[in-house]
């Protein structure tokens, strides 16, 4: 017998064709011989089956000898053998209805697990293969699990259910709730204004939550809460802000903070957490601040950086348009008795300048 696969909630059309290309009498029955529908002349008649309100046919096709059974809003329990009786013949069609759902919300926090559950009719032995938006394939039976969801897992998951050499495809939209960047680093000269941005990697119509930025200054022994805030839709409202530094926060998404000036005592690492309503767990973004200061004290020209720098970063002092006088993988460099002119302090990574501060050395008479 013919096998047709259907998807829960969808509509399926089971075909039944007579040899005569004209409207003749037909009946559709289920495996219990209960009449589903048929015709009486040009009228559609329905039987006492549980499909009554969801079953239909296409009268426009009857004259061509086609008598389809249309079942709307398919349910798993609609899986059955359906029999079309026409011209003293019986055509059997086995309908198997499958459902695939994410057993939790389809909006999941980065790092959480996604479980897809297959609903299938008794006696079936389907296999499932799912392809993630980043092209990763996972296979399984009744359940498929993906642990440690990543940002790239956001999007449409395409799952193929295979049964009796037939296949049916499901598409499930998954939204991974995360910040666009897990970590960022800001390089500033002392006194410059600092901007921290925390763009979200998703858009949700209604977004409610609360957040906090904790800061561990390099010079401090413990971390400190710099700001707490609430989020409602795109509206951001500050609840509490530390007096030093006096941060300012944008009143709408994307989350954005401004530090009036970069100072050595602020250099360090921060962790912005965002707890979303009706979600367990929090979103995190790390932010780092590196501050540079160039000073001249008597006969000593010094350049220093504070904050989380990697060991491969190079700190240099050079007179403008000349070779570096001093260059070290350290957080402070100096030149004694510097000659007059415009000196540059450079923080660089593999030749790329990350931060630069200029200081003018006047001639000594």
């Amino acid at each position: 017998k013919k096998v047709v696969l259907g998807k829960k909630g969808d509509t399926v059309e089971l075909t039944c064709t007579a040899s005569q290309k004209k409207s003749i009498q037909f009946h559709w029955k289920n495996s219990n011989q209960i009449k589903i529908l048929g015709n009486q002349g040009s009228f559609l008649t329905k039987g006492p089956s549980k499909l009554n309100d969801r079953a239909d046919s296409r009268r426009s096709l009857w004259d061509q000898g086609n008598f389809p059974l249309i079942i709307k809003n398919l349910k798993i329990e609609d899986s059955d053998t359906y029999i079309c009786e026409v011209e003293d013949q019986k055509e059997e069609v086995q309908l198997l209805v499958f459902g695939l759902t994410a057993n939790s919300d389809t909006h999941l926090l980065q790092g959480q697990s996604l479980t897809l559950t297959l609903e299938s009719p008794p006696g079936s032995s389907p296999s499932v293969q799912c392809r993630s938006p980043r092209g990763k394939n996972i296979q399984g039976g009744k359940t498929l699990s993906v642990s440690q969801l990543e940002l790239q897992d956001s999007g449409t998951w395409t799952c193929t259910v295979l049964q009796n050499q037939k296949k049916v495809e499901f598409k499930i939209d998954i939204v991974v709730l995360a910040f666009q960047k897990a970590s960022s680093i800001v390089y500033k000269k002392e006194g410059e204004q600092v901007e921290f941005s925390f763009p979200l990697a998703f858009t949700v119509e209604k977004l409610t939550g609360s957040g906090e930025l904790w800061w561990q200054a390099e010079r401090a022994s413990s971390s400190k809460s710099w700001i707490t805030f609430d989020l409602k839709n795109k509206e951001v409202s500050v609840k509490r802000v530390t007096q030093d530094p006096k941060l300012q926060m944008g009143k709408k998404l994307p989350l954005h903070l401004t530090l009036p000036q970069a100072l050595p005592q602020y250099a360090g690492s921060g962790n912005l957490t965002l707890a979303l309503e009706a979600k367990t767990g929090k979103l995190h973004q790390e932010v780092n601040l590196v501050v540079m200061r160039a000073t001249q004290l008597q006969k000593n020209l010094t350049c220093e950086v504070w904050g989380p720098t990697s060991p491969k970063l190079m700190l240099s002092l050079k007179l403008e348009n000349k070779e570096a006088k001093v260059s070290k993988r350290e957080k402070a460099v100096w030149v004694l008795n510097p000659e007059a002119g415009m000196w540059q302090c450079l923080l660089s990574d593999s030749g790329q300048v990350l931060l630069e501060s200029n200081i003018k050395v006047l001639p000594t008479w």
């Epitope: 204004q193 901007e195 839709n233 300012q248 009143k251 709408k252 954005h256």
Partner: antibody, heavy 118, light 107 residues
Framework: EVQLLESGGGLVQPGGSLRLSCSAS????????MSWVRQAPGKGLDWVSS????????YHADSVKGRFTISRDNSKNTLYLQMSSLRDEDTAVYYC???????????WGKGTTVTVSS | AIQMTQSPSSLSASVGDRVTITCRAS??????LGWYQQKPGKAPKFLIS???SLQSGVPSRFSGSGYGTDFTLTISSLQPEDFATYYC?????????FGQGTKVEIK
């Protein structure tokens, strides 16, 4: 059509009080931030106060803190500004304004005049 | 509070002229800046949001640009109905602050 209509302005003595109202129509009032902006004679625009429809949070300019209170009655689609301890420098046309979905003041009323004078 | 400095405070121009008004914020405000037009005795009219997004119904001769601290409103070819006072507004954070205004007068 979105409409805002201010009322309640008038002449008041220094130290006195006044309550301004702004009747809104043509949009879902409770969904939006509403604000008051004033303009002294011959001067520029001066933001006074805002209130969120979603959270009820209120924000005031330093010059009016402790003297003016913004409030709203979502069931009546009305915004209020309770002004007390009025000073000469509060003399202005007071405009009611509605924020759009991106939190910019997009629709303004015609204004109501408040004169503080002895 | 964030200060908004608008310049010039007034300018004289002729119909067909290209007019540029600048606005500077005392600190970075992303692109959270709006522009408004006001005619005598009338309420302000919203022209531009997010520094450069023209509101529906606003003629395309108006344009805005900028990010961070420096912003510009340009009228490419001044029309008689454009003679008015223009204000910038920082909408980054509370308190909201306006520039002091630029009056565009007929030369």
């Amino acid at each position: 059509e979105v409409q805002l209509l201010e009322s309640g302005g008038g002449l008041v003595q220094p130290g006195g009080s006044l309550r301004l109202s702004c009747s809104a129509s043509g949009f879902t009032f409770s969904d939006y931030v509403m604000s008051w902006v004033r303009q002294a004679p011959g001067k520029g625009l001066d933001w006074v106060s805002s209130i969120s429809g979603l959270t009820g949070n209120t924000y005031h300019a330093d010059s009016v803190k402790g003297r003016f209170t913004i409030s709203r009655d979502n069931s009546k689609n009305t915004l209020y500004l309770q002004m007390s301890s009025l000073r000469d420098e509060d003399t202005a046309v007071y405009y009611c304004a509605k924020d759009n979905e991106d939190y910019y003041m997009d629709v303004w009323g015609k204004g109501t005049t408040v004169t503080v004078s002895s | 509070a964030i200060q908004m400095t608008q310049s010039p405070s007034s300018l004289s121009a002729s119909v067909g002229d290209r007019v540029t008004i600048t606005c500077r914020a005392s600190q970075g405000i992303r692109n959270d800046l709006g522009w408004y037009q006001q005619k005598p005795g009338k309420a302000p009219k919203f022209l531009i949001s997010a520094a450069s997004s023209l509101q529906s119904g606003v003629p395309s001769r108006f344009s805005g640009s900028g990010y961070g601290t420096d912003f510009t409103l340009t009228i490419s070819s001044l029309q008689p109905e454009d003679f008015a006072t223009y204000y910038c507004l920082q909408d980054y954070t509370y308190p909201r602050t306006f520039g002091q205004g630029t009056k565009v007068e007929i030369k």
